[in-house]
């Protein structure tokens, strides 16, 4: 409807930059609406260029608010079923006319991008998009070309007679596998891609194609050189050669055919319908996804985009599947969150890339003062008294194995166990029998102590027990503290990582 300066933006801006007359072109590009970025390089659903553009000449004092726009519609033919959700990219290009170094100059004035949801066959949807100081008012709709029907422009299909297969020469219908394509009633030889029919023996051409069998592409511009003018309604006939013949893309651009026209994939630093423009500056924000634009300070110098992690392409328009590089070690699950990469580690592994093997004594240690013992490619915990399990996390009953001999009573204690010996027995496990007459303790006292005074012997044994218990307790305390510190460090890191992963997946 209109393209011009937005409201409240001061003096209306001329698109011609006071360099003489210019024309505006609009390039409409449709992309699948599945990606967050909607900026994959090719217009996979189709692209088209406005034609019949009036010349705009700036006159002193004239308002630039209502610029002459291309006549009629911009039609974008799409070959496959209509996806319903899509990304609409509209670029406004200025062609500077008149005496100019190197002929006409092209500049991208504005680019608007937006995801849309639209069923085919519905009414016109209106939209206003602002970019910089420009405002674009436009309407859009999706319409099926017969024989396609419905909100998704599915091909005309009919139910299968037999559930397993379609009739001779008929294929399953792509959107509806339980249906078959209707038998062709078109003129023999009518192009299945570019032609259709509503009556038997008819061949009607889709937009962009002409000829009795709809096999000849129509030029989008006025006839050049040897190209033969066709009927008034069909534009120009291109006999034989395809739209990419002779490579219309300049500056090393690569050409691909799209719906009878062509599209140039331009190298970085170049823009335009034929990659002929390097007039986009960094201030225009040509790098998608937050990419850093370098160079391109003026329209004559090319720019380069330095892409954020996870993006590539000359304009950072393509998302990279960084998980395909398998960065997570030891079987970790890779999650590409766009702005970050996260690894969800298997049990027994930790670290940003699951690089720490916790089944290794260098990784996580044993809990509660247990000692890590490696062997045979795995590790085992030798647990302190009172603890058991794989990591010494389970409390064990030290009295379960009945360690007190000769009827001694066992008491569980924080540092292990204590035996209360029956009368006539002594020792840590009540293993020594004490003779009632104060003679030798039997049977296990060391040889050198057998002839000694029993009271001295008892005092010696108790002193040894006390020293051993104190040493064990001190050792356990030191080990527990150091292990807890190491455990806390790993657990904190793991909890933080899981929290981040949860947060970022939600974001």
């Amino acid at each position: 409807h209109s393209f011009g300066p937005g409201p409240g933006l001061g003096t209306p801006r001329s698109p011609c930059n006071a360099r003489g007359p210019c024309r505006l072109f609009f390039r409409v590009c449709l992309k699948p609406g599945v990606s967050q970025e909607a900026t994959e390089s090719l217009c996979a659903l189709g692209a088209a260029l406005s034609t019949s553009v009036p010349v705009y000449t700036e006159h002193p004092g004239e308002s630039a608010a209502a610029l002459p726009l291309p006549d009629g519609l911009v039609r974008v033919p799409f070959r496959d079923a209509w996806p319903g959700t899509f990304s609409l990219v509209i670029e406004t290009w200025r062609e500077q006319l008149g005496e100019h170094a190197g002929g006409p100059a092209w500049n991208l004035l504005a680019r608007v991008v937006g995801r849309r949801r639209l069923a085919a066959g519905g009414p016109w949807a209106r939209d206003v998009q602002r970019t910089g100081t420009w405002e674009l008012h436009f309407s859009y709709r999706a319409r099926c070309e017969p024989p396609a029907v419905g909100a998704a422009c599915a091909r005309l299909c009919r139910s299968r007679s037999a559930p397993s297969r379609c009739g001779p020469g008929l294929r399953p219908c792509t959107p509806f596998p339980d249906e078959c394509e209707a038998p062709s009633v078109c003129r023999p030889g009518c192009s299945p891609e570019h032609g259709y029919c509503e009556e038997p023996d008819e061949c009607r051409c889709l937009e962009g194609w002409t000829g009795p069998l709809c096999t000849v592409p129509v030029s989008t511009s006025s006839c050049l050189n040897s190209r033969v003018p066709g009927p008034a309604s069909t534009g120009c006939l291109l006999p034989g050669p395809g739209p990419c013949d002779g490579n219309p893309c300049a500056n090393g651009g690569s050409c691909s055919e799209t719906s009878g026209s062509f599209e140039c994939a331009c190298p970085r630093g170049f823009y335009g319908l034929r990659c002929e423009v390097s007039g986009v500056t960094c201030a225009d924000g040509p790098c998608f996804n937050g990419g850093l634009c370098v160079g391109g300070e003026d329209p004559d110098s090319a720019y380069v985009c330095h892409c954020p992690p996870g993006f590539q392409g000359s304009n950072c328009e393509k998302r990279v599947d960084r998980c395909s590089l398998q960065p997570c070690q030891n079987g970790g699950l890779c999650l590409d969150l766009g702005h970050a990469l996260r690894c969800r580690c298997r049990a027994g592994f930790a670290g940003p890339r699951c690089e720490h093997d916790l089944d290794d004594c260098a990784g996580r240690a044993c809990a509660n003062g247990g000692t890590c013992v490696e062997g045979g490619g795995s590790r085992r915990c030798s647990c302190a008294l009172g603890f058991g399990g794989r990591d010494c996390r389970e409390r064990a009953d030290p009295c379960a194995s009945r360690p007190c001999a000769h009827g001694g009573r066992c008491y569980a204690h924080f540092s292990g166990l204590v035996c209360a010996c029956a009368p006539g027995y002594m020792g840590v496990r009540c293993e020594f029998a004490v003779r009632p007459d104060g003679a030798d303790a039997v049977p296990a006292a060391p040889r050198g102590l057998r002839q000694a005074d029993p009271q001295r012997f008892l005092a010696g044994v108790i002193a040894v027990i006390v020293v051993v218990v104190i040493a064990i307790v001190a050792g356990i305390v030191v080990l527990v503290i150091s292990r807890k510190k190491r455990m806390a460090k790993y657990e904190k890191a793991e909890i933080k990582e899981m929290g981040e992963m949860h947060r970022e997946l939600n974001a």
Epitope: E37, G114, G132, G285, G290, L292, P309, L341, A507
Partner: antibody, heavy 117, light 107 residues
Framework: EVQLVESGGGLVKPGGSLRLSCAAS????????MNWVRQAPEKGLEWVGQ??????????HYAESVKGRFTISREDSKNTVYLQMNSLKTEDTAVYYC????????WGQGTTVTVSS | NIVLTQSPATLSLSPGERATLSCKAS??????VSWFQQKPGQSPRLLIY???NRYTGIPARFSGSGSGTDFTLTISSLEPEDFAVYYC?????????FGGGTKVEIK
């Protein structure tokens, strides 16, 4: 010439609110991700948050320290990005800069926010 | 978040001398490191991106190097206008984080 101009800073009591603005000129604003970065007195730089483009549904991301208290929005028609700061704390005292892109290429001159009782 | 540690905190040098600033990351950040310069009362300015690439308009005396966890900013011959605070920033993992800064002062 690219210019980013922040405004809206000032003195506010703890628990109070403030709205900062950043007006851009010389760039096609709607094509740029916008960030807020702050710098506490005599301290280093800290990223605060980010807002992306219309084509990204104006997705926002925030630093943990401000999540739930600060909100970033943008008005492409006015070439302006905003930082709404609620439940302000003394530790939010800083110079606040707006900056563009993922790599913080263009920076504004900053606006000072002081949170004090 | 990834932590960046800059050293030294202060570097006292004379004009014409070579300045070497270090930045260490707590984990691998590839080459996604930038260096910023901040003069008193001014906003930061991007100098180096991608660890070693000079940004538009930055003089050739500034160079960056490193990858993984260790990065260096070198000013080959200090000019009077180079005395400022320099920050490294990592852009490998979201959110972006900055080092504590190195102040390059006149000796």
């Amino acid at each position: 010439e690219v210019q980013l101009v922040e405004s809206g800073g000032g003195l506010v009591k703890p628990g109070g609110s403030l709205r900062l603005s950043c007006a851009a000129s010389g760039i096609t604003f709607s094509n740029f991700w916008m960030n807020w970065v702050r710098q506490a007195p005599e301290k280093g730089l800290e990223w605060v948050g980010q807002i992306r483009l219309k084509s990204d549904d104006y997705a926002t991301h925030y630093a943990e320290s401000v999540k739930g208290r600060f909100t970033i929005s943008r008005e492409d028609s006015k070439n302006t990005v905003y930082l709404q700061m609620n439940s302000l704390k003394t530790e939010d005292t800083a110079v606040y800069y707006c900056t563009t892109g993922y790599y913080f290429d263009y920076w504004g001159q900053g606006t000072t926010v002081t949170v004090s009782s | 978040n990834i932590v960046l540690t800059q050293s030294p905190a202060t570097l006292s040098l004379s004009p014409g001398e070579r300045a070497t600033l270090s930045c260490k990351a707590s984990e691998n950040v590839g080459t996604y490191v930038s260096w910023f310069q901040q003069k008193p009362g001014q906003s930061p300015r991007l100098l180096i991106y991608g660890a070693s690439n000079r940004y538009t308009g930055i003089p050739a005396r500034f160079s960056g190097s490193g990858s993984g966890t260790d990065f260096t900013l070198t000013i080959s011959s200090l000019e009077p206008e180079d005395f400022a605070v320099y920050y490294c920033g990592q852009f490998y993992s979201f959110p972006s984080t900055f080092g504590g800064g190195t102040k390059v002062e006149i000796k």
